[in-house]
Structures are given as C-alpha cells and as structure tokens.
C-alpha cells in the first residue's frame, strides 16, 4: 500500500500545521475557538469564529442575530449563513415600501391599474406595479382625472398601493390582479386598524414613515419613524429590534425609536456567547461535579467545559442556580468530541474520564 510518510514529512515538526492524507497536503491548524472556512486551511485568515445557530459573523467579527422572516407578509430570500444574515423580502403579490436591514419593515399589495390604464411593469418584491395609459394620449375611460392626467414629473402613473399590517396580512392570499373591483375591495379590507401606529392615512413624503409628533410650522423636528419593533440605526435605516422571546432571555431595555431592545439571560443563568444587544447562548450557573471545576469565565466559550482541578486546590463552584433546577447529571460523561458549536480544547487523560462538552450530545 502506498505510504504517506514522504508527504507527511513536509509539515513535520511544525505544530501549527498537520498533514491531511485525504488531500495529500499540509494544512494550517486553526487555533482553538476558531473553525476552518475550507477543507485544508492554508493561513490564519482561513479560520473564523463560529456562531450559534441563527447567528452570523458580521464584518466586525461579532456574532449577530439573523433577521427573522416570521411575519405573514415576508418570505425568506436567502438563508442565514455563517457569514451573512438571512434576507427577507415581501411575499409574492406585495412590494416593500419601507426597507429595513436585510428585510422589509412594511409591505404593500401591488397596485391594480385603474380603468384605462394597463400594466407597464409588473410589481416585484421591491417595486410596485407601474401603469401606463392603455393607448397613446389620454383615455376617456379613466376612472378619475387624477389617474389620467399626464404626470408633470414625467413619471409613470401608479395606482395607490394597499398597505398590509403584519397582523392582518394573512387574511387574504388571493393575488390582486386585473382591474376588478372585487380584488380592490379585498385588498382595501386589509388596511390597518385606525389605532395602528402606522402612517396610513397620513400625508407623508415617505410611505411607512411618519413624524414622531405633529411638526410645528417651519420646524425641522420631524424624525423618520420606523414600524413597531424596528429602530432607527446610526445610518438612518430602520433595523429590526432583537427579540427576547427565547425562554432563557429577559428584556433588559425596550425597543425604542433610536435603539434596539436589549436582552440578557434570565436570573440563574449567565451568558456563554454574547451577541449584539443580546446573548446567543445562556447557560445555568455551573454546578461543579466531584473532582471537576467549571470554567464559565470565557464569554467566547460555547459549552460549559470541565477539567480536573489542579492538585491541592478546592473547586471554586457556584451554588445551585436561583431557580433551584439541578443539572440532569452532575457528573460529566466522557465525550469523544466537542459539540459542533464548541470551541474549547482540552486534554483527555486516559486515566480519568473528563467531559469535553456538557451538552450531553
């Protein structure tokens, strides 16, 4: 059988590299806590931090929550990847009137071209339907002079879009097509309730945005306002506030017009993996097993990991968590490999079993 030794010798003595017999190459060994971005890393830049599920690594190397497309009027355009957020767009038959980072803060149904007008460009997830007169010149069959007059700006006239509230958008899934009164009526029933904090029915230069208060005459104090559960970020974009809906999180500060909601771990838990405005992973205050000591200090660690305490020392353990729940097993079971989210490297003595991961997977 062929021997790999001659190839293996090319990385011999270099602890930062290893020889991969499968690809017959020396590869760079990513340091602990970092994961490879290719099968045979060649340099440190081929190693990255790994985030929890539904989080991605942003440009600043922070684990950031992927946006959710759970609203009825949104669909997933691209999934949450290790280095990019999930991207949401308005569902078919709707377009985005107020964009948000990687999502849309407000979707409207595509307009129905009024009588005497025909579709020039069909609506997309980003743009409303564009209408044009059915024949050159002004058609006498126009429903109203407003829809028929030539636009002074040279733009193509559009019918008024129908807003959809996230809460009611599931009420109609029928596509609004043609110029039928039925379709228009069905769409018009999906407007927001009068008490909804949206800009529907208010004059506004930017659909979906409104002043935070009535503007005094001549005053410039009219801020752009985002939809509920969105805030205005430093770049002036409407950005989704993080959600604290996970069982292990509680709200620390609410979602405000200019700042995100912030979440923290509920009492009795500590944050093992931080994320922007939240915590990607909360773990119970560790309870030390006999002859082991937990190390929860490193915020980058993905799992509570165990190691034998130094000789002659007492384990420095936290008491039972405030909620009184004890872990399923206080003595760690020996685990061959660190959990796929883990980033801790530990020696495994052959004499005493030591768990690399407390997840029990």
């Amino acid at each position: 059988f062929p021997q790999d030794r001659p190839f293996e010798d090319t990385c011999h003595g270099n602890p930062s590299h290893y020889y991969d017999k499968a690809v017959r190459r020396c590869c760079y060994r990513c340091p602990m806590g970092l994961f490879p971005t290719q099968q045979c890393p060649q340099r440190p830049t081929d190693c990255r931090k790994q985030c929890e599920p539904d989080y991605y690594l942003d440009e600043a190397d922070r684990c950031t929550a992927c946006v959710t497309c759970s609203r009825d009027d949104l669909v997933e355009k691209t999934p949450c990847a290790w280095n990019s957020s999930r991207v949401c767009e308005c569902r078919p038959g709707m377009f985005c009137s107020t964009s948000a980072v990687n999502s849309c803060a407000r979707c409207f149904f595509h307009s129905v071209c009024p009588a005497g007008m025909i579709v020039k460009f069909p609506g997309t997830a980003q743009k409303n339907t564009v209408c044009e007169p059915a024949s050159p010149g002004v058609s006498p069959a126009c429903a109203s002079p407003e829809n028929c007059k030539e636009p002074s700006s040279g733009t193509i006239p559009q019918a008024k879009p129908t807003p959809v509230s996230p809460a009611t958008s599931s009420a109609s899934t029928m596509p609004v097509r043609g110029g039928t009164r039925l379709a228009q009526e069905a769409a018009s029933k999906l407007t927001r309730a009068p008490d909804s904090p949206s800009s529907v029915g208010r004059p506004s230069s930017d659909p979906g945005l409104s002043p935070t208060q009535p503007c005094p005459e001549g005053s410039g104090d009219c801020r752009k306002q985002c939809e509920p559960d969105y805030y205005l970020d430093e770049a002036g974009r409407c950005t989704a506030c993080v959600s604290c809906s996970r069982d292990d999180l509680v709200e620390k500060t609410p979602c405000a017009w200019n700042s995100s909601r912030t979440c923290e771990c509920r009492p009795g838990m500590i944050c093992a993996t931080s994320a922007t405005n939240s915590c990607a992973r909360c773990v119970p205050y560790p309870i030390c097993a006999a002859e082991t000591v937990t190390k929860p200090q490193d915020m980058a660690e993905k799992d509570t990991t165990f190691e034998a305490p130094p000789l002659g020392t007492q384990p420095d353990c936290n008491p039972t968590p405030e909620n009184g729940e004890a872990p399923a097993s206080t003595s760690p079971t020996q685990s061959l490999l660190v959990d796929s989210q883990a980033s801790k490297t530990l020696p495994i003595p052959t004499s005493a079993p030591v768990a690399l991961s407390s997840t029990g997977k």
Epitope: D20, V23, M32, F35, R48, L337, I348, S357, K361
Partner: nanobody, 123 residues
Framework: EVQLVESGGGLVQPGGSLRLSCAAS????????MGWFRQAPGKGREWVAR????????YYADSVKGRFTISQDNSKNTLYLQMNSLRAEDTAVYDC????????????????WGQGTLVTVSS
Amino acid sequence: EVQLVESGGGLVQPGGSLRLSCAASGYIYSSNCMGWFRQAPGKGREWVARIHTGSGSTYYADSVKGRFTISQDNSKNTLYLQMNSLRAEDTAVYDCAAGRVVLGAVVCTNEYWGQGTLVTVSS
C-alpha cells in the same frame, strides 16, 4: 498527542458483515467531526463516511450508502463503522480521521489519522 487506533478488520466472505472501531485518546483538538476513509491496493484514498459529532449528522459515499453505518459512542470515546453486504471491491485498508466541520459546508478537515485496519472481502 492524539491517538486514533482502528480495530475490527479481517477476512470476510462476500455478503458478510464487519464492525470497525476507532478508539480515540490523548489530546482531541476541538474536533467535531470524525470520518472513515479507505485505500484499496494500488488506488487512491477514498472517503467512506463521516459524522458531525455535535449534531449527529451522518454522510456517506454513494458506493457504501445503505450498506455501511457510521456511529459514535461518547462514553467509550469510540467511533464505529458497521459494514454489511460486503463486496470484493470493499477490500481496503480503512483509516479513521478526526477534524473539524468546515464553516458553511458539510465537509471536514482531517487533522488526526489512525494507522488503518485491513479489511479483505474474499471467498
């Protein structure tokens, strides 16, 4: 130093079964993926199967799908390959490897290797 030691190889008749084991000891380096490779006489090394140990996801080469099963026993620090319906073309030295899942992919690095165990399928 990490040690991966394979066992369970041997001579078996076509249609028979074998179970290979790979015992790990020493310093496992943030590994979250283990796999089996094989190398037949005069041929290149071929990937057989792998398991992502955190999620338990398993992947198989087309040539062994439905016949081989990869599994792990964390309590014994051991990886297994159950081989059923063996064929003459499965004759090879079988190696186990440990490494890490590549971000955004289902492939793994192969940072640690065993010395291999010989499986011969012959009547």
